[in-house]
C-alpha cells in the first residue's frame, strides 16, 4: 500500500477506489456535495487521502479540464503566505486575497481563488492508488 507520507509521488498506479478517477499516477475524487474547507479536509483524511495538493502547472492544467466554473476546495491555505497542506509554498501560480477572511484556496477551470474557509464548496481529494509503492 501507499504508506508513509500522504503527499508522496506514486508510480505504476494500478487502480483507484469506486467513484475515484485515475489520472497520471494518482487517484482523484471530485465531490458531488459541498462542504466547508475543514469538513472537506476531514472527508479526504478519512479516506486515506488528502485535499488536492497540486505539484506543478502541468498537473493544474490537466485537472482544470475536469472542472467547471464552480470552485472546489484544494489543500491550500494562507498561513503567513500561501502553502499547500504538505507544507510546500505555492510557487507556480498566483492567488490573491481580497479580504482578511479569505485564507483558504479553491480552484475552478479558470484558476485559483482565495475564499473564506466557511463557504460550502465542492472539493477534490488526491491519493495513491491500491497496491502501489510510494516514491520518496
Amino acid at each position: 500500500l501507499c504508506q508513509g507520507s500522504n503527499y508522496s509521488t506514486c508510480a505504476s498506479c494500478p487502480s483507484c477506489p469506486d467513484r475515484w478517477m485515475k489520472y497520471g499516477n494518482h487517484c482523484y475524487y471530485f465531490s458531488v456535495e459541498e462542504k466547508d474547507w475543514n469538513s472537506s479536509l476531514e472527508f479526504c483524511l478519512a479516506r486515506d487521502s488528502h485535499l488536492l495538493v497540486i505539484t506543478d502547472n502541468q498537473e493544474m492544467s490537466l485537472l482544470q479540464v475536469f472542472l467547471s466554473e464552480a470552485f472546489c476546495w484544494i489543500g491550500l491555505r494562507n498561513n503567513s503566505g500561501w502553502r499547500w497542506e504538505d507544507g510546500s509554498p505555492l510557487n507556480f501560480s498566483r492567488i490573491s486575497s481580497n479580504s482578511f477572511v479569505q485564507t483558504c484556496g479553491a480552484i475552478n477551470k479558470n484558476g485559483l481563488q482565495a475564499s473564506s474557509c466557511e463557504v460550502p464548496l465542492h472539493w477534490v481529494c488526491k491519493k495513491c492508488p491500491f497496491a502501489d509503492q510510494a516514491l520518496f
Epitope: N98, S99, V101, Q102, V119, P120
Partner: antibody, heavy 120, light 107 residues
Amino acid sequence: DVKLVESGGGLVKLGGSLKLSCAASGFTFSRYYMSWVRQTPEKRLEWVATISISGGNTYYPDTMKGRFTISRDSAKNTLYLQMSSLNSEDTAVYYCAREGGYGNLWFAYWGQGTLVTVSA
Amino acid sequence: DIQMTQSPASLSASVGETVTITCRASENIYSCLAWYQQKQGKSPQFLVHNAKTLAEGVPSRFSGSGSGTLFSLKINSLQPEDFGSYYCQYHYGIPFTFGSGTKLEIK
C-alpha cells in the same frame, strides 16, 4: 433577485436599546457573510458590524464593540442587530448588506434601510 | 485605522462631460478598494471592486483605476442617471472604512 428588507427602526430614548432585523431572500443566505452599514444625517457611511457564514465570527469597529451585537438565523434567513446604550451619534439609517461571495467583503447588495432616531 | 479621503466633496458637471473622483488611502491598501453610487433617497449601489473591476451590470462609461494609496473613478460621457453621490471603501481588513463622499450635481 437578491432582496434585503430591514425593519425595527424607530424613535428610541438616549441610553435605550433597539433590535433591527433584516429579512433576506433571492439567494442562499447560509453561503454569505452579512453586514450592517449605517448612514448618518450628514450622509457619511459607517461600517457597523459583519458576521461570518456560521455566525461564529463577528466583527465590529472599536466604537461599537460591546454596545452592538450582530447575529443571524439561517433557518429564518434573517440577520439581526441588537443595539444598546444608544446615543445621539447612533442616529442614522441602518442598512443590511450582503458581501460579494467567497468572503469578498465589499457590500454587493444593500437593503432599503431603516431609520433609527435617538432622542433625549 | 486606515483613513479614506475623497475629493472633491462636490462637483457640478453637464450631461456628456467626463468627470474624475479621487480617493486617497492613509496607507498602502494595494487594490482593495470599492466604489458605490447613491442616488437621492435611495440605498447605495455597488459599482467597482478591487479598484478597477466593474460590478455586473455597471455601464462601461464607468472605470476605476489606481493602487497603493491613490485611486480614481472616472465617468465618461455623463448621463442624467449618473448624478448623485459616490463613495469609496477599503474592503480588505477591519475596520472597513468609507470615504466621506463626493456629490455630483447637474450644472
